[in-house]
């Protein structure tokens, strides 16, 4: 058989023998020559070396590149390729000698005592195991143990060839520590070389640490790292570890495999790291490294040590916080610290408990803020082990967008007497304050709300063509005051008012209020009417349970059928504040009310009574009159707000004081509630009597002592009273000093 | 720098013996899986033989199965093959590998010629 | 063993072309395949892992993608210095197996 690239000027070797396969008997000479056109080698089996003493090769006598290759008494174990080649050259002359050996029928390897197989569990794997025959039509089986089995071939996946060996697929003796081929002469059953089976998984899945992140510890403490590696099956693992302080007389190391359920395609391996106590050297990277001698896979953590316990503010610890109302607010507690300290938050020097609207934790997390949240908050950090404190002061302010009282309060459908001068306010509250409010107008036909038109909850007026106050042609005569700032319900609040020097023409006014959070806006519809006039007796807005009547009246030659009406529920749903007139034109929506008629000289009255008004009556009440000469129904409409019987409550305290004979006290306290609370001080239980010392003003809210005696010391007592009953507050003020004696005594 | 070089190779005869050296340096060696890998002059990629950073478990490619052994000094950080039994189709590039996923850091190459 | 097939065995480019390696293997790696550059003389240098993770330093015109067992290796734009050869590698079961390469040289 001649081997390798065909040359142009060399022609192969040429063997004496010219065969593939040779086939001879143990104990004879094998005998052969190759000659060939420059220098030539042989190569034979097993260590294929010049070295072998049994081997001779020697120049022939008849001429030049000729070498004849020389065994005597072969054995089984020649069997195998020789091959004659040129120098440098892949050029060459291959024949297979079978040594037919029937004490030895298997070729060992010289350097084998046993043989290695590698397999992977795979089912569509094969392995060969290399036993090799020294004659060619051997009839072979396969050996494994333990247990012990025999595989024979199948004509199929399991075979053996005399020159390769035993073809078997490797699941079927992924089971066996060791294997071996048998083959069976005359009754006599001849054993390979033991191969012993060894099966090879290839992946490191990964490598995880535990503690992975964060490990924190001070000095003496002990260090216990764990370091798993998730494998396929099969795979062996050596550990490695790399840390800081290698001479470490304290460390330990544990490597275990670790059990997996059954049927699980994986193994886990663990390695233990641990240093009882640990110095300020053993600070730094851990890695641990898992080597299966085909994969290495590595993790890394950081171990800090600690000299002692200690606890202090991160530098990125926040002073200001600022959001707006409604948002969520998150305030971290950004410090360092070994241990982790305890963490307490303050309001106000007040503990904050978690509920449902703040969570008080490593982050302060405040729901939904809301105006009450602004404050200061303190964050106390404690460190559990050496009890040492760390405080820090965050200031949380909360915006609000510019929100416009009147637009809950005011009723849309107000209709206002031609030719009178109105004043239409806007009282908006906003945090910080509006850097500007903002006055527009337009025609009320301009902005019917006629059915034929699309109209929207969050936009009720199909119109869009506000024009500047500033252009009044073709509306009222307009004049816009000088934005007020008023403390109303305890709130700054800024007002601007918008004149109607005369209301000629039915028209919407909108005020637009921005800051630096949002906008705010109400419309005002302006219902010019020539029609009746409404009164309320004897009030603007009574308290729930007090009597209350709506007049109205007209002037009985021009008007007929005065009726009194209530709006009732709205077709649409629509926002407060936001719906067009006149109403005159859907009756549907109103229910009629009793009345009572009067007249004088000139005008009818009809009064509609409400006795113990509840919060049921509020609403919009329109008086409808029918003109004597046209029929045309004129309406008016008139919103009724009830207040809510509220009990009285002081709001802010009374502080415990001390002062100095001689000196003034000045305290106030301020008491809300409907109806408004009348306001008593006491001393020590009893009655404060005014006197030339002590100065009660405004409604009782502030109390003035002046030039304080020994006698002024006792205890103050504020009370707030109602029909609904009292609110009070105390304070304890002390007088120091010596009292002086006056010439009197 | 993180770097394999690689010594030892050389002309042998069919039967001869060589030993290859790699010395790592740049990395901590005794955590890694190494590797050699050869190139037959003009030809592909082939894997020859694996180890263990603790010399636990070795691995071979059957054509050199009982005539390379692989083998490690961590203290030295140093990978070895040594080589018995040489034939002519062990001519080749030996390459040593740190192996990670891959073969990430290979030494230089080292020729080793098998020729009577 | 699991033989890694890979075509073609050689392509002739020209700087700024797109070139496109296939490697295919005898059976199912799932995505257990690296690549690698050989330029002559030297030692091959790992390019991707995993089928598609890029080395860190490998520039971002060669990419890598397949599973199971047909990969794709391309060059989006291929620069002077991309000349090689080029291998893939399975790194499924034992024992390592590559291909036979694939050199990318001057049209």
């Known amino acids: 058989a001649s081997v390798g690239l065909p040359s142009v000027s060399l022609d192969l070797p040429r063997l004496s023998i010219q065969k593939d396969i040779l086939t001879i008997k143990a104990n004879t000479t094998l005998q052969i020559t190759c000659r060939g056109q420059r220098d030539l080698d042989w190569l034979w089996p097993n260590n294929q070396s010049g070295s072998e003493q049994r081997v001779e090769v020697t120049e022939c006598s008849d001429g030049l590149f000729c070498k004849t290759l020389t065994i005597p008494k072969v054995i089984g174990n020649d069997t195998g390729a020789y091959k004659c080649f040129y120098r440098e050259t892949d050029l060459a002359s291959v024949i297979y000698v079978y040594v037919q050996d029937y004490r030895s029928p298997f070729i060992a390897s010289v350097s084998d005592q046993h043989g290695v197989v590698y397999i992977t569990e795979n089912k569509n794997k094969t392995v060969v195991i290399p036993c090799l025959g020294s004659i060619s039509n051997l009839n072979v089986s396969l050996c494994a143990r333990y247990p012990e089995k025999r595989f024979v071939p199948d004509g199929n996946r399991i075979s053996w060839d005399s020159k390769k060996g035993f073809t078997i697929p490797s699941y079927m003796i992924s089971y066996a520590g060791m294997v071996f081929c048998e083959a069976k002469i005359n009754d006599e059953s001849y054993q390979s070389i033991m191969y012993i089976v060894v099966v090879v998984g290839y992946r490191i899945y990964d490598v995880v640490l535990s503690p992975s992140h964060g490990i924190e510890l001070s000095v003496g403490e002990k260090l216990v790292l764990n370091c798993t590696a998730r494998t396929e099956l099969n795979v062996g693992i050596d550990f490695n570890w790399e840390y800081p302080s290698s001479k470490h007389q304290h460390k330990k190391l544990v490597n275990r495999d670790l059990k997996t359920q059954s049927g699980s395609e994986m193994k886990k391996f663990l390695s233990t790291l641990t240093i009882d106590g640990v110095t300020r050297s053993d600070q730094g990277l851990y890695t641990c490294a898992a080597s299966s001698g085909l994969m290495t896979k590595k993790n890394s953590t950081f171990v800090r040590v600690h000299e002692k316990p200690f606890v202090a503010f991160g530098s990125g610890m926040e002073s200001l916080v600022e959001a707006t109302v409604g948002e969520r607010v998150r305030i971290p507690a950004k410090y360092l610290g070994y241990p982790p300290p305890e963490i307490k938050w303050y309001k106000n020097g007040i503990p904050l408990e978690s509920n449902h609207t703040i969570k008080a934790g490593h982050v302060l997390t405040i729901m939904e803020v809301s105006e009450r949240d602004t404050g200061n908050y303190t964050v106390i950090l404690t460190n559990p082990i050496s009890k040492e404190k760390q405080s820090h002061v965050v200031s949380l302010v909360v915006y609000v967008p510019p929100q416009i009282g009147e637009k809950s309060l005011i009723s849309p459908v107000d209709s206002y007497q031609y030719g009178t001068t109105q004043t239409l306010t806007c009282t908006v509250y906003a945090i910080p304050p509006p850097h500007h409010i903002h006055w527009y107008w337009q025609l009320e036909e301009e902005c019917a709300n006629e059915p034929s038109q699309a109209v929207s909850v969050t936009n009720p007026y199909p119109c869009e063509e506000w024009r500047s106050v500033e252009d009044f042609q073709g509306g009222n005569k307009i004049e816009v005051n000088k934005n007020q700032f008023a403390l109303i319900e305890g709130k700054n609040k800024t007002v601007s008012t918008l004149v109607i020097q005369a209301a000629n023409v039915s028209a919407l006014y909108k005020c637009e209020a921005v800051n630096k959070v949002g906008r705010g806006e109400r419309v005002i519809s302006f219902h010019v009417t020539r029609g009746p006039e409404i009164t309320l007796q004897p009030d603007m807005q009574p308290t729930e349970q007090e009597s209350v009547s709506l007049w109205c009246t007209a002037d009985r030659s021009t008007f007929e059928n005065l009726t009194w009406y209530k709006l009732g529920p709205q077709p649409l749903p629509i926002h407060v504040g936001e719906l067009p007139t006149p109403v005159c034109k859907n009756l549907d929506t109103l229910w009629k009310l009793n009345a009572t008629m009067f007249s004088n000289s000139t005008n009818d009255i009809l009064i509609m009574e409400l006795k113990n008004a509840s919060l049921q009556d509020q609403g919009d009440y329109v008086c409808l009159a029918q003109d004597r000469k046209t029929k045309k129904r004129h309406c008016v409409v008139r919103q009724l707000t009830v207040l809510e019987r509220v009990a009285p409550t002081i709001t802010g305290n009374l502080e415990n004081q001390t002062t100095s004979i001689g000196e003034s006290i000045e305290v106030s306290c301020t008491a809300s509630g409907n109806p408004p609370p009348q306001i008593m001080w006491f001393k020590d239980n009893e009655t404060l009597v005014e006197d030339s010392g002590i100065v009660l003003k405004d409604g009782n809210r502030n109390l003035t002592i002046r030039r304080v005696r020994k006698e002024d010391e006792g205890l103050y007592t504020c009370q707030a009273c109602s029909v609904l009953g009292c609110a009070k507050v105390e304070a304890f003020f002390i007088i120091e000093g010596a009292q002086e004696k006056t010439n009197l005594e | 720098e993180v770097q394999l070089v690689q010594s030892g190779g050389g002309l042998v005869k069919p039967g001869g013996s060589l030993r290859l050296s790699c010395a790592a340096s740049g990395f901590t060696f005794s955590s890694y899986s190494m590797n050699w890998v050869r190139q037959a002059p003009g030809k592909g990629l082939e894997w020859v033989s694996a180890?263990?950073?603790?010399?636990?478990?070795?691995y071979y490619a059957d054509s050199v199965k009982g005539r390379f052994t692989i083998s490690r000094d961590n203290a030295k950080n140093s990978l070895y093959l040594q080589m018995n039994s040489l034939r002519a189709e062990d001519t080749a590039v030996y390459y040593c590998?740190?192996?990670?996923?891959?073969?990430?850091?290979w030494g230089q190459g080292t020729l080793v010629t098998v020729s009577s | 063993d699991i033989q890694m097939t890979q075509s073609p065995s050689s392509v002739s480019a020209s700087v700024g072309d797109r070139v496109t390696i296939t490697c295919r293997a005898s059976q199912g790696i799932d995505n257990w395949l690296t690549w690698y550059q050989q330029k002559p003389g030297k030692a091959p240098k790992l390019l991707i892992v995993e089928a598609s993770s890029l080395q860190s330093g490998v520039p971002s015109r060669f990419s890598g993608s397949g599973s199971g067992t047909d990969f794709t290796l391309t060059i989006s734009s291929l620069q002077p210095e991309d000349f090689a050869t080029y291998y893939c590698q399975q790194a499924k079961a034992f024992p390592p197996t590559f291909g036979g390469g694939t050199k990318v040289d001057i049209k």
């Open positions: 180890i263990s950073s603790s010399s636990s478990y070795i």
């Open positions: 590998a740190r192996v990670t996923d891959a073969f990430d850091i």
